[in-house]
Amino acid sequence: EVEKTACPSGKKAREIDESLIFYKKWELEACVDAALLATQMDRVNAIPFTYEQLDVLKHKLDELYPQGYPESVIQHLGYLFLKMSPEDIRKWNVTSLETLKALLEVNKGHEMSPQVATLIDRFVKGRGQLDKDTLDTLTAFYPGYLCSLSPEELSSVPPSSIWAVRPQDLDTCDPRQLDVLYPKARLAFQNMNGSEYFVKIQSFLGGAPTEDLKALSQQNVSMDLATFMKLRTDAVLPLTVAEVQKLLGPHVEGLKAEERHRPVRDWILRQRQDDLDTLGLGLQGGIPNGYLVLDLSMQEALS
């Protein structure tokens, strides 16, 4: 922390400008009025201050606003935002999407920092839900943002916001997250026709139940293998060979290359070998002819 010393004669800053880069840290502390800094924060961005000088400027703002900065200052923080700690940010009340965008821009191209995560958390909590405009903004800066949320947090995403989600935004989502997002997507896209619906819902299908996959198999969707491999194993297992053939269409041939991987491997083990042979792909490992299959889980449920 910089010692309190009187400002040398003639050095009192009348405005925030480039002459301040020639000030030593103690001179900045002594000669820059915090209220002046707060009203001219937008100028700081255009001046190549050292990180040490930025520390002094931040200290002055902290003294002026011990309870947290007002949004008028936050919006113009620019690269001073990188000096903020999550504890600083928790004191803020950020309500404007423009402010959020301005601060995300500062961190653009970098991984999501703890500061950014805290900022987003404060913003979303302040809004009460993850609305479409916010989601649009966040996924534009951080394609993986959606998958960084817990299932509980995802439950606050309204179905209307799902329109903002791009396939790449879901790349790192796990099944628990897709379980929450899929019903919302189904609701959001329910009024679309078959082929358009499939294009939109495809990235969310990792959360789809068996009955929805059965319904899709009746619609000539030609699901690609990459999508099929991301389906829930428990949703794929009850599908018949005929249903999988209809679901995949011409892509059914790709099953051979994936026969050792889930969910294909587990699905093969549940099918009659006779039925698998009808595909003509040489898939092995099905239930031999003449064997009786007992579904023990069903029996346990009944007893």
Epitope: E18, N45, A46, P48, F49, G78, Y79, F81, A102, V106
Partner: nanobody, 117 residues
């Protein structure tokens, strides 16, 4: 995306050096540039400044009349011409770029060493 300084070296008192600050991976046109120096064990201090257009320049009192800052946007480079060098000018010189017009990016170079002895 980085700034690379060059032109430093060992020079006798009264001699001259010309430092260069070249941008790699981005265009300097929209950036104000500052030259800073840090002597061993001392605080880093501002030496010179040039606006993005080149229309405005500024200098620390200790170098006024001896140092001249200029820019060649076509070459994506800013220069610091240092004349009448003194032993107290010794230090590591680095340049910094700050974005104007709401561009929040800022870049620092690694520095080039100047020894006046």
């Amino acid at each position: 995306l980085q700034l690379v300084e060059s032109g430093g070296g060992l020079v006798q008192p009264g001699g001259s050096l010309r430092l260069s600050c070249a941008a790699s991976g981005f265009t300097l046109d929209y950036y104000a540039i500052g030259w800073f120096r840090q002597a061993p064990g001392k605080e880093r201090e501002g030496v010179s400044y040039i606006s993005s257009s080149g229309g405005s320049t500024n200098y620390a009192d200790s170098v006024k009349g001896r140092f001249t800052i200029s820019r060649d946007n076509a070459k994506n480079t800013v220069y610091l011409q240092m004349n009448s060098l003194k032993p107290e000018d010794t230090g590591v010189y680095s340049c910094a770029a700050a974005g104007c017009y709401g561009n929040s990016s800022r870049y620092w170079g690694q520095g080039t060493s100047v020894t006046v002895s």
